[in-house]
Each structure stands twice: as C-alpha cells, then as structure tokens.
Interface confidence: medium
C-alpha cells in the first residue's frame, strides 16, 4: 500500500460481498496535531493517508482534554456534560460512587449516558465491533457491541490489527459494518517523556508501523478503496514542570475540608461526601482563590461562569469549583504531590498543544484535501452519514462536515421559524406614558415629536436600513410562543421581545472608519419611552433607579451615531437592557474602542448583539418559567450573559453588506456578572483587560443560537452546509504550541 500512488477512485471499489463500505474508527491516544507536521518523515504510512485522503489542520477536543471524556464524545456526538463522562475521575452524589480508570465501577452503565455509535449502528440493523474503546465493555442501555474486547493494554498493536482484519474476513451475515480500534500511544510515551522526546518519536514510529500493517491488510483484501477509515486522536499533549505548580496550601490555611481533583483541569468539592456535597461553600472557595497573586497561573470559576463554548457545567458530576489552568502548569493540593514533569493534558481545549489529529480516507471522502479545523462532536454525525443511518440526538451540527464528503448523504436546510414576528407600528409621536423616563434636552413636546417622528420610517428607508444593517437577514426566532416585533431605525434594526420587555437582538453595521479614535460620548441623562411599544410591554426607566447595582445599558450604542441628533434613535426604552455597573464599563469600552478597531481591521463589521437567559446553565435558552423563577421582585429579568456576533467579509476588499463569498465570524458570549473579578482589573486601565476578557469568552455562532433560540444568516446566499461550517467555527488566537 505504501509504495503505490494515491488511488483516485470516483466511487467505492468494494469486492464481492461488500455492498456498502465498512467504517473503521481508529484512535491513537494523545496524538497531538503538531506531531503530524514535525515528524511526518518518521511516519510514512500515516503521512500517506494525510497526502492521499482528507485531513484537518487539527481537530478540537472537548474540555477537559482527557481520554475518557473525549473518546466517548467522539462516539456519541455529545459534550461530556451531556454524556456523563466528565473526567477520567469523578464522583456522582446521586450514585454516591466514584468513577476511576482503575476501578471496576467504570463498567457500571449508570455512568454512561447517550447513544454510542455501535448502538446506533446496531439499532438500525448493522453489526459493530470494538477493539477497545471507552464504554465498549459496558452494557449501555442494556447492550454491548456485537463484538467487543475487554480492555487489556498489554495486547500488542499488531495483534489488535490482525484481529480487526479477521473480523473483516467474516462471512457477510456476521461481518460488522462499523469497527473501532484504539492505541494507547503516543499518549503513554508523551506522559513519560513529554511531547518533545525520544520516547514520543519512537512511539510515533511504532503506531505508524502498525497502521501500515492495517492498510497493507486492507490492500491484500482489495478493501483499501472500499473501507472508509477515520484516524483521529482524543487530545494532544503538553510539557509540565515541577517548578510550574500552584499549591492550594498557598491559598488556604487548611485544606483538609475539601477534596481536589488535581492537575491541568482541577475541580474542588467537599471532602465529606455525600453529607457536605450540597452545603459546601463553593462561592467562598472561588472568592479565596480569585486575584490573590499578580502572577497567578490559574483562574478560579464557578462552573456556570466558565466560557460557554466549553459546555462544561450542567452535570452534578462537574463540581462547582473549577480552576482554569495556564498552559504547562498544574494545580495541586500541596507540595506532597510530586506528579510533575513529563507530559500531561486536560487543559483549555483552545491551547494548540491540546489539538488532536483527524485524517480520513476511503471512497466517501474527498482526496488530497486539507480542511479547516472542526470539533470532535461533529464526528458522530459524519460516521452516521458514512453508514447511511440516522443519528441519535446529539450536540453536533449535522451537515457541517459535508465538505469532507464527495457526495453528502444528508442535506441540511435552514430551520423553520417557530414564532412569527410583527412590526411595532408607529401611531402617535407623543408617548401615552413617559415610563418615568426623562430627557432634559427635549424641552417641549414639539422637540419630543420631532425625535419620535424619526422612528417613523418610510418603506424606502426600511429597505435601506435592512440592506445595510441586516445584510444576512434578520435572526429567525426558533423559540415557541415568543411575541416579538421588529423595530427599524436608520442606524440599526432590533427584534423586540415583548414578554422580556427588552430587545432580543439588535443588528447594525459599523463601517471601516477613517480614524480609529474612540466614539464620542453618549448624550447624557436622556431617555424616553419608545412610542412604538405599548407601555405594558416596555421597561420603565425607574427600574434602574432603585437598585444601584443594576443600571441600564444600550444594546445598540447610541454613540455609534456620529451626530447627537441621530443618537436620539437609540436613547429609547426599546434599546435598554439591564446591566451591572461593572459589566457596563467593559461593555462600553468594547463598543467605543474595540469594535472600532475590529471594523477598521476588517473593512467594516456587522454586529448582532443581545441578552441571554441561561439560569440553569445548560447551554440552551431558558423556558419562560425558568426565567420567572429568577425575577427579583421586578418586571425586568436580568440576563445571565450577553452575546455579540461580529461578521465581516473574508475577502477584506468587500464590506459586510456587499460580500459575495465566505464570511468571517467572531462571536462572544460574555457572562453578565456584578463584578469584573475574573479579570482582576484593580488598578488596571480597561485597555489591559477588556479585550483579553472578551477573547476568553469567544464562542461559536452555534453556541449563540442555542442560548438564544435565534437562527442566523438565513438570507446569506450560500449552501446551507457552508453556513453550518461558519456557525460551528470557533475563532482562536493561540499562536504558541
């Protein structure tokens, strides 16, 4: 196989008895993406697969970047919080049991949720064989794979390969269509010697040789252009050092009252379980660990406050206190922990060192192609398409990997809008109620009428503002029974949610400005009722007077209007959103400084922003009754997060509203918190921390959609599968490995 040129078969070349291509899912644990480029000459077989087939620059692992969570994510398409294997070690208070890789408890089906690929295949009449895979020797939903091997790490790789080849030789009636294969390398060697070590180089040669044996075996059976093979890894690997340790004894006078899962992705819970599990004061722990040292190498979070892109919160097994650790550092209880040096993983899944490989080859895959990175939650849907079966519900976005396939099996379409919109009509330029709002600059009702009359756009003006400010179409509402209306302005368009009494989204386009100086200040102390929205559906300005902690923010920044006259279009109740004062500082800095910078760098940006309500921190928009539960004696619910989606043209010679090709996206989901303690901003100007904070909370457009019940880009003229690629793209700014 190795000696031959790449075969370019237009359709599958399967021998007699192979009606449809088998699928082999092959995992090499801890194979970080960089190995593929640095050591390519040492791995001729894997390198040939890369050259002849399709590969991504890298595949993103899910957080924490550990073995069991990610292997099970790959075969279920679910986030660890959804499938339950949230770490290699964990405690479940409901089961009152501990899960670890060294105990038989790992084979208790109660730990394993979701539907793994082998069951999906079997439920639809196909056979499945697993040569090791986390979960494969567990009776998930009462069933095992058709063929499986109890895990034994000492079985030589060559023996594993020859067994899989024997399975392919089985009679048609007994032969599986789906296979898994698992190698512990190069992870074991990476742990022992670190990612840049002779041991890893040796391990790469060993796994390449075994992989070559598989490909040669397929060739001998004339299956090398019949089998669809996916070669991937669960995560990467990074170097650790014994002088890069954070000890909890440096932060607490005593540590015996808590238990800590140590390492690159630490969690802290009560020591005395189950008794103290729920009463444990997680908030106090986080407070004690926040902003304690100028060079602190971890950030403490309550899990609901972690970046939403991680989807690591909604599971009782995920302890409430989480430490987000710097690259190559470890956080442990005390100096008695000497488990350092060598390699480790589990870190932030945006770190380049945590990136995993993805290569694929076979009749269904495109050839000699490199694709942009994607997340491992997408692989399950892809494998279902290869097997021509229906996936179980999962966190992947079906169709987002269609560009890997010669002929896509599943054609996605845009979601149907669930709640239709109305237009908030303009009746009277005088408000029927002031809603306790004041604008001293409007000294009589003639002036008030004049500024309100500006809200009464003609059809031509509406068409013009939509073209500029909604260049990709208005967000469609996928939540049920959401009474909302569109509000048109010359400089922005918003979708107003009547039950929430606030805009669900606001969309506007910031052009590339000649100068990048910050925006002028907003007209001070000027607010008025929006005459297009009935008072019963509006916020009162007086809502913001009682509790000094909450102030009003503007979703569309009034200062974006270059003249104070047009600022009045934004100084209205329908543009108000509740914000903590500390949060607003950051929000205002982003809009007055960073947004201008982005617009300048990108030849203009379209901005869509809005509130998010995720009180139950499940990554999906809350039902109205969930939000009502959190109304603190007020009509106005306080958002848990705010989103901002910046969209520009990939080809920077075009503006967003005249973009013929691919778009570039930069979405943010910023937790709405009363303090900025996450950034330790004491004594620091905003320029030193706001951008870093926004960058920490970058997300995918898809994450925004799930949290808001909105659907974006429906009017962008582009195949839906390409739009889904855009929606599942996560911008990253990590440069060092």
């Amino acid at each position: 196989w190795l000696e031959e040129n790449c075969d370019t078969a237009q359709q599958s070349q399967c021998p007699e008895g192979f009606d449809l291509p088998p699928v082999i899912l092959f995992s090499m644990d801890g194979f970080r993406a960089e190995y593929l480029y640095t050591w390519d000459t040492l791995m001729p077989n894997i390198n040939k697969l890369k050259t002849c087939g399709i590969h991504s620059k890298y595949m993103r692992a899910m957080y924490p970047t550990k073995t069991f969570p990610n292997h099970y994510t790959i075969v279920t398409g679910l986030y660890p919080e959804s499938h339950g294997i949230i770490d290699n070690n964990m405690y479940d208070v409901n089961l009152n049991k501990n899960f670890s890789l060294s105990s038989k408890e790992q084979n208790n089906p109660a730990w394993w949720h979701g539907q793994p690929m082998w069951l999906t295949a079997m439920y639809q009449g196909l056979k499945a064989a697993t040569y090791f895979w986390p979960g494969s020797e567990v009776a998930i939903n009462g069933s095992f794979p058709s063929i499986y091997m109890p895990y034994n790490g000492s079985v030589p790789f060559e023996e594993r390969i020859s067994t899989l080849l024997k399975w392919l030789d089985l009679p048609k009636a007994e032969r599986p269509r789906f296979y898994t294969m698992y190698f512990e390398e190069p992870d074991s060697s990476g742990h022992a010697g670190g990612p840049v070590s002779a041991r890893v180089i040796k391990a790469l040669q060993v796994v390449d040789h075994a992989f070559g044996m598989l490909m040669e075996g397929l060739k001998q059976r004339n299956l090398h252009n019949c089998v669809n093979i996916i070669l991937l890894a669960d995560h990467g690997m990074d170097q650790t050092y014994c002088n890069k340790m954070e000890y909890m004894t440096d932060y607490f006078p005593r540590i015996n009252f808590f238990y800590m899962y140590e390492g690159p992705a630490p969690r802290i819970r009560a020591h005395n379980i189950p008794h103290d599990f729920f009463s444990f004061n997680s908030e106090e722990i986080v407070r004690n660990l926040s902003c304690r040292k100028p060079d602190q190498h971890f950030k403490p979070y309550l899990t609901p406050d972690l970046p939403k892109r991680l989807h690591y919160a909604k599971n009782v097994r995920i302890d409430k206190v989480h430490l987000f650790v710097d690259q190559q550092w470890l956080a442990v209880r005390s100096k008695s922990n000497t488990n350092c040096g060598g390699g480790n993983h589990g870190y932030n899944n945006e770190f380049r060192s945590m990136e995993a490989i993805f290569l694929a080859h076979g009749p269904s895959f495109k050839e000699k192609t490199e694709v942009e990175p994607f997340e491992n939650i997408e692989v399950y849907n892809l494998m279902c398409d290869l097997l021509r079966i229906q996936p179980a519900p999962n966190n992947g976005t079906h169709g987002s990997l269609n560009h890997l396939l010669k002929v896509p099996f599943y054609e996605p379409s845009h979601a149907e809008e669930v709640s239709k919109f109305s237009v908030c009509g303009f009746a009277n330029p005088l408000p029927t109620e002031s809603l306790d709002c004041f604008c001293p600059h409007l000294q009589n009702s003639t002036q008030l009428e004049q500024v309100n009359q500006m809200l009464n756009l003609t059809q031509e003006e509406i068409t013009a503002t939509v073209k500029v400010n909604l260049p990709f179409g208005r967000p469609r509402v996928l939540q049920k029974n959401v009474d909302h209306c569109l509000l048109y302005h010359r400089e922005y368009v918003s979708g107003f949610g009547k039950a929430m009494r606030m805009p669900m989204w606001s969309s506007y386009t910031v052009p590339q400005l000649g100068d990048t100086s910050p925006l002028p200040p907003t007209v001070p102390d000027c607010l008025r009722a929006d005459v297009r929205v009935p008072p019963s559906e509006s916020q009162k300005c007086s809502f913001y007077l009682a509790d000094k902690n909450i102030t009003h923010g503007f979703l569309y920044p009034p200062a974006s209007n270059r003249t104070s006259d047009s600022q009045y279009d934004a100084l209205i109740t329908s543009n108000l959103v509740p914000m903590y004062e500390e949060f607003r500082k950051m929000w205002d800095y982003f809009h007055s400084v960073l947004l201008i910078k982005h617009a300048t760098e990108r030849n203009g940006v379209n901005v869509v922003s809005g509130p998010i309500f995720d009180y139950n921190y499940d990554g999906h928009f809350d039902a109205p009754d969930e939000i009502t539960k959190h109304l603190a004696n007020t009509d106005v619910p306080i958002p848990t997060h705010y989103f901002v989606v910046l969209t520009s043209c990939k080809n920077k010679s075009h503006t967003p509203e005249n973009c013929p090709g691919w778009l570039d996206v930069l979405p943010f989901i910023i937790p709405h918190r009363p303090t900025n303690v996450e950034s330790c901003p004491e004594g620091k100007p905003e320029a030193l921390w706001v951008e870093e904070r926004f960058t920490a909370h970058i997300a995918r457009v898809r994450d925004v959609e799930l949290l808001t019940g909105l659907d974006f880009y429906q009017d962008k003229v582009q195949p839906v599968s390409e739009i889904l690629q855009l929606k599942t793209y996560l911008p990253t700014f990590e440069t060092t490995i």
């Epitope: 009277n428 330029p429 005088l430 029927t432 109620e433 002031s434 809603l435 306790d436 004041f438 001293p440 409007l442 000294q443 009589n444 009702s445 003639t446 002036q447 008030l448 009428e449 102390d525 007086s542 007077l545 009682a546």
Partner: antibody
C-alpha cells in the same frame, strides 16, 4: 370648551385640560401639542374627549361627548413645557349637565 | 399611576403662625441622576384657577413670597407657610410630574385662619 392663548407663542407650549367638580380636587384629562395637534388622553376619558386647536387664532378646544351629571365641573386649560408643572392656567369654564 | 396623598385634609392656623402640609407619593418621584424631585405645589383660592407656587419640590416660582417653602425627597414632601397671612387662606394641592401621563394631584388641603 375653548381656550385662547395670548402673550406667548402658542405652538411652543403644550396645552393640558384639567377639571374640578364642585368642592372636589383636580383631575387631569389630557394633553395636546398645539404645533402638531397630537394628543394623549387620560384613560378615563378615552373615546369621549377630543382636543383640537386653531393655531391661526391661538386657540385650543376640548370637546367631551356623551355627558352625564358627574361631568358637571369647572374645566381649566393650562400650559406647560414637557417635563415641567403647569405654570399658567385659564380662568376656568363651568359646565353644568342637567337632565 | 402614582397616587398622591395629602395630610391633613384641612388645617386651621393662627395668623403669623406656621402651617405645615404633607404630601406622600405612592412611589418615588426622585430622578436620582439629576437629583431632582418632580413635585409641584399649587395654591387655589375660591373662584380662581390654581396658581403654581413651588416646583422641583423646593424651587419657588417667581413672585411667590418667601414665607412659602417646600422640602422633602423621594416619596415624602412638605409645604411650609412660615407665617400665615390672611391672603394665604386657600386650598393647596401637590402634583407629581414624574410618571406622566397622567399628571396626578393630591386631594387638597384646606388652610383656614384659627
């Protein structure tokens, strides 16, 4: 009921109508911008009251229909700018509704 | 709507004595960022329209004698006539112009000479 303004620019100030039944307090009825003729009425009078103006003679009008005995009152016009109290009042017109 | 409640309903004071009228609003009429209370006091003599005495809770309208003063903030306000004169016999009304429309008035306090 009519209300003729003098001594200032009629269109620069809003006209409000307030009534007072004998021996009772003051009750706000509605508001008109003489410049545009736009009006806002108190909920209680919605559908029964109409406020108009003739700028050429600097006069505001208030019409109340379907009168009942409890509408017997003195009807005042008053002027104001938007977020200020009523600085000048008309002398009032007594309207008596009899069966 | 904001409800204004005055006390007492009527008041008899000797000439030259102090008269104090209270007014309570059902919600705050203080616009905190301007630190202004949107409250006015009017005087109405028999057979006459009301006359503006005080606005912003404590600012005297021009031409109003300085024996009239207003105080208070938020929801509780007071009109004080420091030395009652015969011409001060009237009904006094407080009015909020904070949450409008509607502009709402207190029920009135009648001041007489004892």
């Amino acid at each position: 009921v009519s209300c003729k303004a003098s001594g200032y620019t009629f269109t620069s100030y809003d006209i409000h109508w307030v009534r007072q039944a004998t021996g009772q307090g003051l009750e706000w009825m509605g508001w008109m911008n003489p410049n545009s003729g736009n009006t806002v009425y108190a909920q209680k009078f919605q559908g029964r009251v109409t406020m108009t103006r003739n700028t050429s003679i600097s006069t505001a009008y208030m019409e109340l229909s379907s009168l009942r005995s409890e509408d017997t009152a003195v009807y005042y016009c008053a002027r104001t700018v938007l977020l200020w109290p009523f600085d000048y009042w008309g002398q009032g017109t007594l309207v008596t509704v009899s069966s | 709507d904001i409800v204004m409640t005055q006390s007492p309903d009527s008041l008899a004071v000797s000439l030259g004595e102090r008269a104090t009228i209270n007014c309570k609003s059902s919600q705050s009429v203080l616009y905190s960022s301007k630190n202004k209370n949107y409250l006015a006091w009017y005087q109405q003599k028999p057979g006459q329209p009301p006359k503006l005495l005080i606005y912003w809770a404590s600012t005297r309208e021009s031409g109003v004698p300085d024996r009239f003063s207003g105080s208070g903030s938020g929801t509780d306000f007071t009109l004080t006539i420091s030395s009652l004169q015969a011409e001060d016999v009237a009904v006094y009304y407080c009015q909020q112009y904070y949450s409008t429309p509607p502009w709402t008035f207190g029920q009135g306090t009648k001041v007489e000479i004892k």
